[in-house]
């Protein structure tokens, strides 16, 4: 039985060409995260995480997207077009697999909060 | 320049162990996960596993688990694969290939090392 | 585990010809897939990664596409070089897992 909960930063803004954290939080399991797969609005992989081998990163972001925090994400020099749903999906053993959304909103405004669920360590 | 040198051909016995090895060179060792892949004669690939010298991470494709061990030697920039308990399924070519930074594909593979199980 | 599949085992081809060669994954992958081309008594050589990006040194005959389950691999003028076995091969989830393999033979 999946009893795991997935918690995200929720909906976030930024600035544009500023950066941005995009981070997931498996909580009330004791499954093993064997992976994270980063992943965007229209699926396509932005990274993932795999315990035992490390990163990868899609060649088409390796200058924007650096790994981590931890098993999160940060996007760097944003533009309006990155606007959008990102999607955590842990891979786990033995529950199986678990997603969870952000939704990031980029900003043109100078002033630009950056609200999340969770304090980010 | 990005090599891979395996060891050479073997002919083992039923029931018998072999370990091959990986000599790497053209790089720093630590930075690249080295996996091994078999194929079979005439056969397609089979991703047995990686190791992550960087932190000492394997991974094993489930049904190579109890078949292979994946280990290296740091100081001479060595990965080696143990192979037991063979049976003539075990008959095939092993190649030894390194991941490339910050992306999943092998980009550089060994010669291979033939393995053929026969009494 | 997915499943790669490369429905032709074989694909006749003359010099010069342009050539497809696909690759149905058994659920998505999203664009993490790479192509190997793999030469009589040789070791495999990467070409194409995720899906769409050629490894260093490989020439611009070579091209790949697709996205979530369906991906391509194009040779747009075969070159006598080029007989070999080309496989997908799949790293988005483990275990990591090839297909079958596609034979590429020259009238």
């Known amino acids: 039985m999946m009893t795991g909960t997935i918690e995200t930063t929720g909906n976030i803004s930024a600035k544009k060409g500023g950066s941005v954290i995009l981070q997931c939080h498996l909580s009330s399991t004791m499954a093993q995260v064997t992976q994270v797969n980063w992943e965007q609005h229209d699926h396509s992989l932005l990274a993932i995480r795999n315990a035992e081998l490390g990163w990868h990163i899609y060649p088409a972001f390796k200058d924007r997207v650096a790994p981590g925090p931890g098993l999160g994400l940060t996007l760097q020099s944003l533009t309006m077009n990155d606007t959008g749903e990102y999607f955590c999906t842990y891979h786990t053993y033995p529950d199986g697999t678990y997603r969870g959304r952000i939704f990031l909103e980029v900003l043109e405004s100078s002033v630009a909060e950056h609200s999340a669920r969770f304090q980010i360590p | 320049e990005v090599q891979l040198q395996q060891s050479g051909p073997e002919l083992v016995k039923p029931g018998a162990s072999v370990k091959i090895s990986c000599k790497t060179s053209g790089y720093t060792f630590t930075e690249h996960v080295i996996h091994w892949v078999k194929q079979s004669h005439g056969k397609s690939l089979e991703w047995i596993g990686g190791f992550n010298p960087n932190h000492d991470g394997t991974i094993y494709n489930q049904i190579f688990r109890g078949k292979a061990t994946l280990t290296v030697d740091k100081s001479s920039s060595t990965a080696y694969m143990e192979l037991r308990s063979l049976t003539s399924e075990d008959s095939a070519v092993y190649f030894c290939?390194?991941?490339?930074?910050?992306?999943?594909?092998?980009?550089?593979w060994g010669q291979g090392t033939s393995v053929t199980v026969s009494s | 585990d997915i499943v790669m599949t490369q429905s032709h085992k074989f694909m006749s081809t003359s010099i010069g010809d342009r050539v497809s060669i696909t690759c149905k994954a058994s659920?998505?992958?999203?664009?993490?897939v790479v192509w190997y081309q793999q030469k009589p008594g040789q070791s495999p050589k990467l070409l194409i990664y995720s899906p769409s990006y050629r490894f260093t040194g490989v020439p611009d005959r070579f091209t790949g596409s697709g996205s979530g389950t369906d991906f391509t691999f194009t040779i747009s003028s075969v070159q006598a070089e080029d007989l070999a076995v080309y496989y997908c091969?799949?790293?988005?989830?483990?275990?990591?897992?090839f297909g079958g393999g596609t034979k590429l033979e020259i009238k």
């Open positions: 290939t390194r991941a490339a930074k910050l992306l999943f594909a092998m980009d550089y």
């Open positions: 091969q799949q790293h988005y989830s483990t275990p990591w897992t």
């Open positions: 659920q998505h992958v999203s664009n993490a």
